[in-house]
């Protein structure tokens, strides 16, 4: 059975085909090759005598087409116009003609596509937004991309116009994207550059920053006011219902409870015409004029040098107040092994050591008034009694020798030396 | 319209807690703060504090700090009014009341019904 | 604390009256003064706000003035539905608010 192979069978535009013929009759005088599904003079595109190898152009032969001596006709340079049947005759000694016909499809080789949309900034939980894949072309997929992945499946997200186009029902902050479409066909695939949309949005119920309510007279008030919106609000402020200015950070100096009120900060985005507020309480606690004296407590206030740890914590009833700690004249801390805590209630030394000892003191002060806790004496001794294993070296044997005359001292030195441990001992 | 509607009264013994509602219809309710305020057998009116229904940060006067907790379930649009540890001095009507903590000159322009706690042994 | 003193306590008057009750703060405040009515056993509402604002749907009778100090509800001509408590308030000191003790308008 002869039969006719189309290879290939999808062909890009411009490119090239080959009409492939299988099981060819042995016995013939020629062939031809017709364009449509049946043999007709005035579509003929070439024939061939195989006795003199010599091809003939039919009418409807464009100068692209080559017969080849097995039947097999090349097409160069394809157009959409030569999609299509492709039939061949094969007239064979005997007479007796045999036909068959193949087909092949041209396709454009695609453009990169583009997106066109319908509104450049849609508002948030307002519009919806319309994504075009331009250009339109005849037997093409449209497929479409968000943050590079296929589309979910949502209820907000509708395509039509054969895929051609997405619609967005109700757009939000989370839209951005980027989008993209792409076009594919049979022979050819290419994507769009990614469009990012620009969703306006907000503002949303702002923030002010800090959260406290509670401050000391004498602090600086320093609220800062925070709305997530695009594009960014217009910011301002009011004092129990007075304007105050348009800023995002509403600043004053020293309060006092004459500053108690409420603080709203009102927020307005002209591009979604919204607007959003948030009331803040503030209370100022007046300051006491006079800071009470405060006490210094000790963990212990005579310490063993490069063994013990010591707290030292600084008592007082006022509120509101900050601590510092002293050293002979300085402040500290002074080392790495001094550590405050507590909002600096507590001061720590782990461990101590001799240059530790001496006066410590602290002050508490309020932006208005300070007063100073009395002395406290820290003592760090060094164990100056020997080892166990030290005890028993003849310190004699040192000392004596020919004209010597150190051993009545020493002798009364050691009476002391024992003496001082038996005390040691006993305390123990 | 704007209404505020408050639960029914309550009588409790001393150093029980009782906890008071303010339905709020007919406005945004987070767009205005609620407040509260006393007014004891025979006596003028006392406001104890508000609530700021965006945020739910409560602020009180000083007389009420302690004892007396506001709060809210804004998907109800209901404010309440938690006292503990009641005493017979905290026998009074009870009334919630809208303010516009924004625009704050417009004082209280909505008041709840009122609600009666009684203590008593 | 401020203090808000009202004058007089209690007046009596009749139906077509004009009726002036006073407020008097211990320390200026501002504008921040409001009015309200309360009837035996209701709910206050509210009648004027900052000092002279009359609220929505309050009849034209009611008027309010004053600053600083010293405030005036003013009713020109009484109704019956206007016998009632009347006090003031003033909410400049946040938060710290306080009230009058009220002026009892009964019928003469």
């Known amino acids: 059975q002869l039969t006719t192979e189309s290879m290939p069978f999808n062909v890009a535009e411009g490119k090239e085909v080959l009409l492939l013929v299988h099981n060819l009759p042995q016995q013939l005088f020629g062939y031809s090759w017709y364009k449509g599904e049946r043999v007709d003079g005035n579509r003929q595109i070439v024939g061939y005598a195989i006795g003199t190898q010599q091809a003939t152009p039919g009418p409807a032969n464009s100068g692209r087409e080559t017969i080849y001596p097995n039947a097999s006709l090349l097409i160069q340079n394809v157009t959409q116009n030569d999609t299509g049947f492709y039939t061949l005759q094969v007239i064979k000694s005997d007479l007796v003609n045999e036909e068959a016909t193949g087909q092949f499809h041209v396709y454009p080789e695609l453009p990169k596509p583009s997106i066109s949309s319908n509104n450049s900034n849609p508002v948030e939980d307002k519009d919806a937004m319309a994504f075009t894949c331009e250009p339109e072309t005849q037997d093409t997929t449209y497929l479409w991309w968000i943050n590079n992945q296929s589309l979910p499946v949502s209820p907000r997200l509708q395509l039509s116009n054969g895929n051609r186009t997405l619609t967005l029902l109700s757009v939000t902050r989370n839209d951005t994207g980027p989008y993209e479409c792409e076009i594919q066909n049979p022979v050819s695939a290419n994507r769009s550059d990614p469009v990012t949309l620009n969703v306006t949005y907000g503002p949303d119920t702002p923030t002010i920053s800090p959260p406290d309510s509670s401050y000391l007279s004498g602090a600086n008030l320093n609220l800062s006011c925070h709305s997530a919106s695009n594009p960014s609000p217009q910011y301002s402020w009011r004092i129990n219902g007075i304007p105050q200015q348009h800023t995002q950070v509403l600043f004053i100096a020293k309060i006092t409870p004459n500053n108690n009120g409420t603080y709203a900060c009102f927020v307005s985005n002209l591009a979604t015409g919204r607007n959003n507020s948030i009331v803040k309480s503030i209370t100022v606690s007046a300051l006491s004029p006079v800071v009470a004296k405060p006490q210094i407590k000790a963990s212990k206030t005579t310490v063993t040098g490069d063994k013990d740890s010591v707290n030292l914590t600084c008592s007082t009833n006022d509120t509101g107040i900050s601590i510092r700690w002293f050293f002979k004249n300085q402040s500290l801390p002074s080392s790495e092994r001094m550590k405050l805590s507590q909002g600096n209630i507590t001061l720590s030394i782990n461990p101590v050591k001799r240059e530790d000892a001496g006066t410590y003191w602290c002050e508490v002060f309020n932006p208005i008034s300070k007063n100073q806790s009395d002395p406290i004496m820290l003592n760090v001794n060094y164990n100056a009694l020997p080892q166990e294993n030290l005890i028993n070296v003849d310190l004699e044997v040192l000392f004596q020798g020919p004209g010597s005359g150190l051993n009545d001292i020493f002798e009364a030195q050691k009476i002391e030396w024992h003496e001082a441990r038996a005390h040691h001992h006993h305390h123990h | 319209q704007v209404q505020l509607v408050q639960s029914g009264s309550e009588l409790k013994k001393p150093g029980a807690s009782v906890k008071v509602s303010c339905k709020a219809s007919g406005y945004t309710f987070t767009e205005f703060g609620m407040s509260w305020v006393r007014q004891a057998p025979g006596q003028g009116l006392e406001w104890m504090g508000w609530i700021n229904t965006k945020t739910g940060e409560a602020t009180y006067v000083e007389e009420f700090k302690g004892r007396f907790v506001f709060s809210l379930d804004t998907s109800v649009s209901t404010a309440y009014l938690q006292i503990s540890s009641l005493k017979a001095e905290d026998t009074a009507v009870y009334y919630c009341a809208r303010w516009d903590a924004f625009e704050y000159v417009k004082a209280l322009d909505y008041w709840g019904q009122g609600t009666t706690v009684t203590v008593s042994s | 604390d401020i203090q808000m003193t009202q004058s007089p306590s209690s007046l009596s008057a009749s139906v077509g009256d004009r009726v002036t009750i006073t407020c008097k703060a211990s320390?200026?405040?501002?504008?921040?003064v409001a009015w309200y009515q309360q009837k035996p056993g209701k709910a206050p509402k509210l009648l004027i706000y900052?000092?002279?604002y009359r609220k929505r749907g309050v009849p034209s009778r009611f008027s309010g003035s004053g600053s600083g100090t010293d405030f005036t509800l003013t009713i020109s001509s009484l109704q019956p539905e206007d016998f009632a408590t009347y006090y003031c308030?003033?909410?400049?000191?946040?938060?710290?608010?306080?009230f009058g003790q009220g002026t009892k308008l009964e019928i003469k």
């Open positions: 900052s000092a002279s």
């Open positions: 308030h003033q909410y400049y000191t946040y938060p710290l608010f306080t």
């Open positions: 320390a200026a405040v501002g504008t921040y």
